[in-house]
């Protein structure tokens, strides 16, 4: 907390500009009017106020509006908005896009930080749902966005805006997530020709059930490894290897250099050994010829 | 009067980890961002990343951008870097340095990592 | 990353000279410009910051001037103390960075 002390004569502010630089803590909150400050936050961010500076200023908004900034001070914070803290911004009712963009591009190159977490998650409750204009700009500031939101948050994604996900969005995205995403892009894509719709899909398709991967394999998409290595094991352990073989194309070979890692090593385990060898590839570890096959997890179900 | 200290430097080989400490006194070491600071003969100056005083917000370069960790112990006015997945050209000395934001008032008296098979 | 271009990369004078170093941004920083001093095995010193506040405890006889691209850092009348290397740094933009420095040798 600054005392209050008087203004020392003829130091009075009469604009925000660089000569406030050279002012002390305590003659910056005597010495410049709140009112004047919030009306010209648009000079601050290019006049290089330390830390300490910024804190003096950051109070005078703070009794200036204690209920909160308005948009118009907020979209003009600029390095300011380093020191608000997360209780601050929840105060705000920030609903312009561009107002957003600013606070973000502010942050450009910082580790996501708990004001920013806070900001985004005001003005995504503020829009009610994540638009594909929002998720546009805050995966363009932030890839790992989408995948930091719980499976409930992104329940709230609308399918429109999943045209606006690029593959390197859904990088850390574990299953429960993907199992989210993908029915909205199934939706997202649906009108898209074979081809098309796969290389769009191919990416939420860790979330896929068995029954799509079934149907992809009878359209020639030629899979890559990688992607198959995300998919679901569960969705992954009904295929045969005859929907395998085609799911996957040219890229079937792949599988011995995969065959110790899951979901292929369960999946080998699943099937016979007779059909395992039609592939060539020396897969070892299938169901020898002459066992019976017992689905336990149907009698699981039925008990 | 304010003093920085570093220690922690040494030789690493490459892919290895190290850690820096900076410990500081002379000030109020919580009211202030800090920063950490790299100097070659090669590159010159680099500035490596900062913290806020309270620790929320934090930058890296690129360059270092998911290999280092910066942290802060306010209680025990000490700086801290993390360095793993270590390079031939992280080799410098590492400097921490206050941070006032236009510029950098005090700095520590360096110290020197060699990442070197 | 703005780019700061420091000149000359080094330069010979005498004590009592007037020595001006230079410093151009690749981009507009307003005055988000700093000066350091440096002398062998020791840290940088701060000399200056937001182009032309001298820190306290700094001699008068340095000063720092410009705004936008293009800053100068003058020494009025060179010390034997002032022999050193002097780097610019931006702070306008994230990542900060710094000039390659400008060594003042004894002529």
């Known amino acids: 907390e600054v005392e209050k002390t008087a203004c020392p004569s003829g130091k009075k502010a009469r604009e925000i500009d660089e000569s406030l630089i050279f002012y002390k803590k305590w003659e910056l909150e005597a010495c410049v009017d709140a009112a004047l400050l919030a009306t010209q936050m648009d000079r601050v961010n290019a006049i290089p106020f330390t830390y300490e500076q910024l804190d003096v200023l950051k109070h005078k908004l703070d009794e200036l509006y204690p209920q909160g900034y308005p948009e118009s001070v907020i979209q003009h914070l600029g390095y300011l908005f380093l020191k608000m803290s997360p209780e601050d911004i929840r105060k705000w009712n920030v609903t312009s896009l561009e107002t957003l963009k600013a606070l973000l591009e502010v942050n450009k190159g910082h580790e996501m930080s708990p004001q920013v977490a806070t900001l985004i998650d005001r003005f995504v409750k503020g829009r009610g749902q994540l638009d594909k204009d929002t998720l546009d700009t805050l995966t363009a500031f932030y890839p790992g966005y989408l995948c930091s939101l719980s499976p409930e948050e992104l329940s709230s994604v609308p399918p429109s805006s999943i045209w606006a996900v690029r593959p390197q969005d859904l990088d850390t995205c574990d299953p429960r997530q993907l199992d989210v995403l993908y029915p909205k892009a199934r939706l997202a894509f649906q009108n898209m020709n074979g081809s098309e719709y796969f290389v769009k899909i191919q990416s939420f398709l860790g979330g896929a059930p068995t029954e799509d991967l079934k149907a992809l394999s009878q359209q020639n998409v030629s899979m890559d490894l990688a992607t198959f290595m995300k998919l679901r094991t569960d969705a992954v352990l009904p295929l045969t290897v005859a929907e395998v073989q085609k799911l996957l194309g040219p890229h079937v070979e792949g599988l011995k250099a995969e065959e110790r890692h899951r979901p292929v090593r369960d999946w080998i385990l699943r099937q016979r050994q007779d059909d395992l060898d039609t592939l060539g590839l020396g897969l070892q570890g299938g169901i020898p010829n002459g066992y019976l096959v017992l689905d336990l997890s149907m009698q699981e179900a039925l008990s | 009067q304010v003093q920085l200290v570093e220690s922690g430097g040494g030789v690493v080989q490459p892919g290895r980890s190290l850690r820096l400490s900076c410990a500081a006194s002379?000030?109020?070491?919580?009211?202030?961002?800090m920063s950490w600071i790299r100097q070659t003969p090669g590159k010159g100056l680099e500035w490596v990343s900062y913290?806020?005083?309270?620790?929320?917000?934090?930058y890296y370069a690129d360059s270092v951008k998911g290999r280092f960790t910066i942290s802060r112990d306010n209680a025990k006015n000490s700086l801290y870097l993390q360095m793993n997945s270590l390079r031939a050209e992280d080799t410098a000395v590492y400097y921490c340095?206050?941070?006032?934001?236009?510029?950098?008032?005090?700095w520590g008296q360096g110290s020197l990592v060699t990442v070197s098979s | 990353d703005i780019q700061m271009t420091q000149s000359p990369s080094s330069v010979s004078a005498s004590v009592g000279d007037r020595v001006t170093i230079t410093c151009r941004a690749s981009?507009?920083?307003?005055?988000?410009l700093a000066w350091y001093q440096q002398k062998p095995g020791k840290a940088p010193k701060l000399l200056i910051d937001?182009?032309?506040r001298l820190q306290s405890g700094v001699p008068s006889r340095f000063s720092g001037s410009g705004s936008g691209t293009d800053f100068t850092l003058t020494i009025s009348s060179l010390q034997p103390e002032d022999f050193a290397t002097y780097y610019c740094?931006?702070?306008?933009?994230?990542?900060?960075?710094f000039g390659q420095g400008t060594k003042v040798e004894i002529k």
């Open positions: 340095a206050r941070d006032l934001g236009p510029s950098f008032d005090y």
């Open positions: 002379g000030f109020t070491f919580s009211d202030h961002y």
């Open positions: 913290i806020s005083s309270s620790g929320s917000t934090i």
């Open positions: 981009q507009g920083i307003s005055s988000w």
């Open positions: 937001a182009a032309s």
């Open positions: 740094q931006q702070a306008n933009s994230f990542p900060r960075t």
